[in-house]
Interface confidence: low
Amino acid sequence: EEELQVIQPDKSVLVAAGETATLRCTATSLIPVGPIQWFRGAGPGRELIYNQKEGHFPRVTTVSDLTKRNNMDFSIRIGNITPADAGTYYCVKFRKGSPDDVEFKSGAGTELSVRAKPSAPVVSGPAARATPQHTVSFTCESHGFSPRDITLKWFKNGNELSDFQTNVDPVGESVSYSIHSTAKVVLTREDVHSQVICEVAHVTLQGDPLRGTANLSETIRVPPTLEVTQQPVRAENQVNVTCQVRKFYPQRLQLTWLENGNVSRTETASTVTENKDGTYNWMSWLLVNVSAHRDDVKLTCQVEHDGQPAVSKSHDLKVSAHPKEQGSNTAAENTGSNERNIY
């Protein structure tokens, strides 16, 4: 009779994480008598995966009923595969011995590769807001994938970006890998509603890449433009001065009116108007009782936006151009939401 051969027909098996791996093994003969064992790896440090004779292996099931005496199929299934299960598995035939069984012949081995999906990409932007024309960095991270080959792309509103650097770690062999990418994005004034998308394509995703997004609304600061204008006289001794604060983002804004350098009123933007591009407009007005001033008045609209240094715009109010004094107090009123840029 021909000597027993242990046949492992599959050089390699590729399994997605969480699925079940089937490792095939058949013997050409029932002789010599003795059990089959499965190992991961070779040599003295090999790991026992299954022993036909004894032991408890909860993740392993046999394909055939090994108790049948004519059984020559020693294939096994390993459930709930993780990247840590990757390696070369050997089906080894033992010959019954005393006191211990003796290794008789080994199969050629089957390499189990685990395809693990990358985790959902996490995109994070800069810690501090930046203004248009500035370049900001976004990072994208995804972990736990295998095999190592992976493609990462960056998009801004569907348009692919090219200025980025990507690393996959570790460089050597590993059960799973991580990817880290940093993209540079130049902000524009229209980016309040923009999205930066990190797209990860991997063999495990079957053509349906994973995406992580960051809204540039959390990154951008669009500083306001100010315009101070004097409205027609509403009453003989009153002048209405408006400060139009346009195209700013985010909404956090405090406005202070100064009369000749002295604070007249401070208010916080509340009822703002949203522009199509996501920026905001706001208008504040100051009703100045000119009769309370003997000299010309310098009115300043000072705006502190999102904690940044204040910007201001001034308007010189010529007192001499108005009727003679009536009354003595300076009155002030304010309003909100009142302006919209026409694109």
């Epitope: 998009f155 509603h193 009822t271 949203e274 199509k276 939401s337 009142n338 694109y343």
Partner: antibody, heavy 121, light 106 residues
């Protein structure tokens, strides 16, 4: 839930004027622009203009200046478009529409059901 | 005004077929919006900011493009996709629409 409810169909004579209404519910009426769009039978869409109800600021397509006039009534959350000196060219379906990305979970763009205007002698 | 030219004006596609239609602007635009309109119904926003799907829009729809050239793609045509599709720009007033692409089932 955001809704734009437009007034019913109108049959008008040439030279007359008509006022179409668009009642808004389900959001902060004064904060968001209402736009008007024209669609003639078998034709595409034409942007007429827009109004911000809170401030009554308007932007008109140059082509419709003198033809369309927008007004708003904040007490009833209603925007109106008046079309004057009607001709057969004004026969169309008129839509009011609203854009507002952050004011609702179930959409970013809302349209009225349309008002059909027929101009015929 | 910025003239948007859609092509083709009329097209037909079989169920399951990939469909692509284009919108060209006479002047560059920042973003493109796409609407779907079925007969006797109001237009419905499909895509805004060139590529972002509006809530409830199936993932088979996608948008791309920049500058003067934009496109709308349906990865696999379904019966309910038969409609007229319009592009619109909001970069410069008046906010013009394209002439539309009528998509029919083959």
């Amino acid at each position: 839930q955001v809704q734009l409810q437009q007034s019913g169909a109108e049959l008008m004579k040439p030279g007359a004027s008509v006022k179409i209404s668009c009642k808004a519910t389900g959001y902060s009426f004064t904060k968001y622009w209402i736009e008007w769009v024209k669609q003639r039978p078998g034709h595409g869409l034409e942007w007429i203009g827009e109004i911000l109800p809170g401030s009554v600021i308007t932007n008109y397509n140059e082509k419709f200046k003198g033809k369309a006039t927008f007004t708003a009534d904040t007490s009833s959350n209603t925007v109106y478009m008046q079309l004057s000196s009607l001709t057969s060219e004004d026969s169309a379906v008129y839509y009011c529409t609203k854009w507002g990305l952050y004011d609702s979970d179930d959409g970013v763009d809302y349209w009225g059901q349309g008002t059909t205007l027929t101009v015929s002698s | 005004e910025n003239v948007l030219t859609q092509s083709p004006a009329i097209m037909s596609a079989s169920l399951g077929e990939k469909v692509t239609m284009s919108c060209r602007a006479s002047s560059g635009v920042n973003y493109m919006y796409w609407y779907q309109q079925k007969s006797d119904a109001s237009p419905k926003l499909l895509i805004y900011y060139t590529s972002i799907l509006a809530p409830g829009v199936p993932a088979r729809f996608s948008g791309s493009g920049s500058g003067n050239s934009y496109s709308l793609t349906i990865s696999s045509m379904e019966g309910e996709d038969a409609a007229t599709y319009y592009c619109q720009q909001f970069t410069s007033s008046p906010y013009t629409f394209g002439g539309g692409t009528k998509l029919e089932i083959k």
